[in-house]
C-alpha cells in the first residue's frame, strides 16, 4: 500500500524563494511522519525534512545548507525554500514515510517538479537623474 | 474473506490466569495491528491494548499493564492475550478485532466473536 | 489521556424517528472517530470511520458529522434492526478510548 504525492509540475522562484506543496493521499494528523524534498532526478540531495508527530510540535531542517521552513495540512506538507541559486533550478520530489503506528508507509514516486530559479534583475539606478517637473 | 476465530469460553478460579488466542485468516497476518477489548455486562467497550505481528510493537491502555500480556505467534497467525490474577472484576467478554488504515483513519472493521471469562470459585 | 462523553446514555424511541447520539472530547481529535453499533451477543459492527465515512454496505439513513471535539451519529428513519448500543471510539494516540455507550431502545 503506497500513498500517493502530488505536486506542480513546474514552479518559478522569481525572488529566489518558492512554497512547493506536496499533497498527499493520506492524513498525517494521527502519525508519526517523515516528510522530506529531494533533488536531482535520481534525488541525490535531501533538501529539506519535516518531521511531524501528533502530539509534537513540527520539526524542520535541511542538514545540506538549504534555507527551509515548513507547513502541514492534514494531507499536505508546504515546503518554504528561500535564498535559491540560479544553479539550483533543478527537479524535485516529495517524500513521505509514516514511521507509526506500523506498519511503515512510504509513497509511490511523485512527477516531481522543476524549480525554475531567475537571479534577481536589479534596474540600475540612472547616473543622471532627469529634470525635476515643476 | 477476513476472519478472526477466538478460543471458547473459559471458566477460572480466582487468582489464576488464563489466555485467549485470536486466530487470523484472509490476510497478511503481518501487515496488521490487532487491538483487543473488553466487554463487562451492562457496561461499556473498554480497549486494553493493540499487538502489531510484523515487528512485536505492543501499546497498552495504562489500566491493563501488569493485567494483560498481548503476543503472538506468527506460523499460526495468532495472537494471545493472557490475563494474571484474576477477579471477579475480570469476568467479561473479550474481543480481538484488526485495525484497518483508512487513508490516515483508524477504525475496527473486522472483530473476532468474543471469548466469554468467568470468574468463580 | 482523551476522556470521550458520550450522550444520552439511553434512549427510546420509535420506528420511523430520528435519533441523534452525539460524542464529545476533552480535546481536538481531528476526525480520527468511529462508530460502532453492537446487538446483544453479537460483535461490534463498525459504522462510520473518520468521523463522517459510511463504510460499505452500512444503510445511508446512518451519517456522522463533526470536528474537533464534538462529534454526532445521525439515524433517521429507524428500523427495528437499528435498536441496539452504539459506542464512538477515538484514534487519537493510545489509549483509544470508546465513550460509554448508547443504548437504544424500541419504545
Known amino acids: 500500500n503506497k500513498i500517493l504525492v502530488k505536486q506542480s509540475p513546474m514552479l518559478v522562484a522569481y525572488d529566489n524563494a518558492v512554497n512547493l506543496s506536496c499533497k498527499y493521499s493520506y492524513n498525517l494528523f494521527s502519525r508519526e511522519f517523515r516528510a522530506s524534498l529531494h533533488k536531482g532526478l535520481d534525488s541525490a540531495v535531501e533538501v529539506c525534512v519535516v518531521y511531524g508527530n501528533y502530539s509534537q510540535q513540527l520539526q524542520v531542517y535541511s542538514k545540506t545548507g538549504f534555507n527551509c521552513d515548513g507547513k502541514l495540512g492534514n494531507e499536505s506538507v508546504t515546503f518554504y525554500l528561500q535564498n535559491l541559486y540560479v544553479n539550483q533550478t533543478d527537479i524535485y520530489f516529495c517524500k513521505i514515510e509514516v514511521m507509526y503506528p506500523p506498519p511503515y508507509l512510504d509513497n509511490e514516486k511523485s512527477n516531481g517538479t522543476i524549480i525554475h530559479v531567475k537571479g534577481k534583475h536589479l534596474c540600475p539606478s540612472p547616473l543622471f537623474p532627469g529634470p525635476s517637473k515643476p | 474473506i477476513v476472519k478472526l476465530q477466538q478460543s471458547g469460553a473459559e471458566l477460572v478460579k480466582p487468582g489464576a490466569s488464563v489466555r485467549l488466542s485470536c486466530k487470523a485468516s484472509g490476510y497478511t497476518f503481518t501487515e496488521y495491528i490487532i487491538h483487543w477489548i473488553k466487554l463487562r455486562s451492562g457496561q461499556g467497550l473498554e480497549w486494553i491494548g493493540w499487538?502489531?505481528?510484523?515487528?512485536?510493537?505492543?501499546q497498552y491502555n495504562a489500566k491493563f499493564k501488569g493485567k494483560a500480556t498481548l503476543t503472538a505467534d506468527k506460523s499460526s497467525s495468532t495472537v494471545y492475550m493472557e490475563l494474571t490474577g484474576l477477579t471477579s472484576e475480570d469476568s467479561a467478554v473479550y474481543f480481538c478485532?484488526?485495525?484497518?488504515?483508512?487513508?490516515?483513519?483508524?477504525?475496527?472493521?473486522?472483530w473476532g466473536q468474543g471469548t466469554m471469562v468467568t470468574v468463580s470459585s | 489521556d482523551i476522556q470521550m462523553t458520550q450522550s444520552p446514555a439511553s434512549l427510546s424511541v420509535s420506528v420511523g424517528e430520528t435519533v441523534t447520539i452525539t460524542c464529545r472530547t476533552n480535546?481536538?481529535?481531528?476526525?480520527?472517530l468511529a462508530w460502532y453499533q453492537q446487538k446483544q451477543g453479537k460483535s461490534p459492527q463498525l459504522l462510520i470511520y473518520a468521523a463522517t465515512h459510511l463504510v460499505e454496505g452500512v444503510p445511508s439513513r446512518f451519517s456522522g458529522s463533526g470536528s474537533g471535539t464534538q462529534y454526532s451519529l445521525k439515524i433517521t428513519s429507524l428500523q427495528s434492526e437499528d435498536f441496539g448500543n452504539y459506542y464512538c471510539q477515538h484514534f487519537w494516540g493510545t489509549p483509544c478510548t470508546f465513550g460509554g455507550g448508547t443504548k437504544l431502545e424500541i419504545k
Open positions: 478485532a484488526r485495525r484497518d488504515d483508512f487513508s490516515g483513519y483508524d477504525a475496527l472493521p473486522y
Open positions: 499487538f502489531y505481528p510484523g515487528s512485536n510493537d505492543i
Open positions: 480535546e481536538n481529535i481531528y476526525s480520527n
